[in-house]
């Protein structure tokens, strides 16, 4: 007879897996809120700021009640990759005014990266279809002025904040259905 079979592969508990993803998302949400408040204190902004290169808010993609886990995770991963790219761009090209948001902006980037890895892991553990590799995104043009960089920062942090709220709501709602 051949060698004894190895220990059975423990299938992950999807609720526990989702839980740790929600925890990271909530933690990043709190960081983003704090950084957005810091930005508002230093550079008050009137009204909503938009940046055409940012993803459309996921919440407009449909009511939360109709969401399915693969759709939420795929959409969230795509949106967060875009936000990661924008945060990197902001740190590189945002100008001297935004240097006052370091090291917090660097910490945010690292935590965003960690959440993206966590999502990737969750998708593979739950045997969800892996999204195709992302096509190379066109480079982001540098802000036209110092104020342009500040407006971009308001748009990026505001959009990320709302996206993370959508993610927490969606993931916790899906958890109740598992």
């Amino acid at each position: 007879p051949g060698p004894p079979p190895g220990p059975p592969r423990v299938s992950p508990d999807p609720r526990a897996e989702l839980d740790s993803t929600v925890l990271l998302t909530r933690s990043l949400l709190a960081d983003t809120r704090q950084l957005a408040a810091q930005l508002r204190d230093k550079f008050p902004a009137d009204g909503d700021h938009n940046l055409d290169s940012l993803p459309t808010l996921a919440m407009s993609a449909g009511a939360l009640g109709a969401l399915q886990l693969p759709g939420v995770l795929t959409r969230l991963r795509a949106d967060l990759l875009s936000y990661l790219r924008h945060v990197q761009w902001l740190r590189r090209a945002g100008g001297s005014s935004l240097k006052t948001l370091e090291p917090e902006l660097g910490t945010l980037q690292a935590r965003l990266d960690r959440l993206l890895r966590r999502l990737q892991l969750l998708m593979s553990r739950l045997a969800l279809p892996q999204p195709p590799p992302d096509p190379p995104a066109p480079p982001l043009a540098p802000p036209s002025s110092a104020w342009g960089g500040i407006r971009a920062a308001h748009a990026i942090l505001g959009g990320l904040h709302l996206t993370l709220d959508w993610a927490v709501r969606g993931l916790l709602l899906l958890k109740t259905r598992l």
């Epitope: 998302t25 909530r26 808010l57 919440m59 449909g62 009640g65 709220d165 959508w166 709501r169």
Partner: antibody, heavy 119, light 111 residues
């Protein structure tokens, strides 16, 4: 001053519907979720659901799914809760409350709207 | 759903005394340094008022005599020295999962 002002008391017959409004002022309406909480006499507070004013639809406590409908009018900074197929157990004070994104704690509350269901 | 049980149901104390209110959850509401428990005060005919969020953070404008502690399933709201205006009903609430739920309340009365 941050404020949530709710519509007045309502008396309804069983089977009817009620729609309560909650007008927000003193803060950016879209920066927070709007939650709704029920307080029936002698019962514990009950979370009904919440809505993000940016859109994407509300989420509900399963107990209220199908009977509660949460909506917002962003331009008027006003949230609404409609409760249909009313029964006597729906007699309660209903509160709107400002909810911290992603954390569900409520730092500003409306004054409450009393709904009485009686034939 | 997570069930929160508060004790005692009522408590009679005098101004100046220390009040300790307890809230126990049917399962852990803490994860990696976060405890998703919040405390509210409610007076008759009024809406609840947030006192403490995420177990131990004092809400802006709330007097420093209020403090929150605990983790896992057991949480405490402490009022270090009672003032006349503190006599009210206190509720704990969790937001660990959906739906958020509330405890049944502890009524703090003047002795």
């Amino acid at each position: 001053e941050v404020q949530l002002v709710q519509s007045g008391a309502e008396v309804k017959k069983p089977g009817a519907s009620v729609k309560i409004s909650c007008k927000a002022s003193g803060y950016t309406f879209t920066d927070y979720n709007m939650d709704w909480v029920k307080q029936a006499p002698g019962q514990r507070l009950e979370w009904i659901g919440d809505i993000n004013p940016h859109g994407g639809g509300p989420i509900y406590n399963q107990k209220f799914t199908g009977r509660a409908t949460l909506t917002v009018d962003k331009s008027a900074s006003t949230a609404y809760m409609e409760l249909s197929s009313l029964r006597s157990e729906d007699t309660a004070v209903y509160y709107c409350a400002r909810g911290e994104l992603g954390h569900w704690y409520f730092d500003v509350w409306g004054q409450g709207t009393t709904v009485t269901v009686s034939s | 759903d997570i069930v929160l049980t508060q004790s005692p149901a009522s408590l009679a104390l005098s101004p100046g005394e220390r009040a300790t209110l307890s809230c126990r959850a049917s399962k852990s509401v803490s994860t990696s340094g976060y405890s998703y428990i919040h405390w509210y005060q409610q007076k008759p005919g009024q809406a609840p008022r947030l006192l403490i969020y995420l177990a131990s953070n004092l809400e802006s404008g709330v007097p420093a005599r209020f403090s929150g502690s605990g983790s896992g399933t057991d949480f405490t709201l402490t009022i270090s020295s009672l003032e006349e205006e503190d006599f009210a009903t206190y509720y704990c609430q969790h937001s660990r999962d959906l739906p958020p739920t509330f405890g049944q309340g502890t009524k703090l009365e003047i002795k």
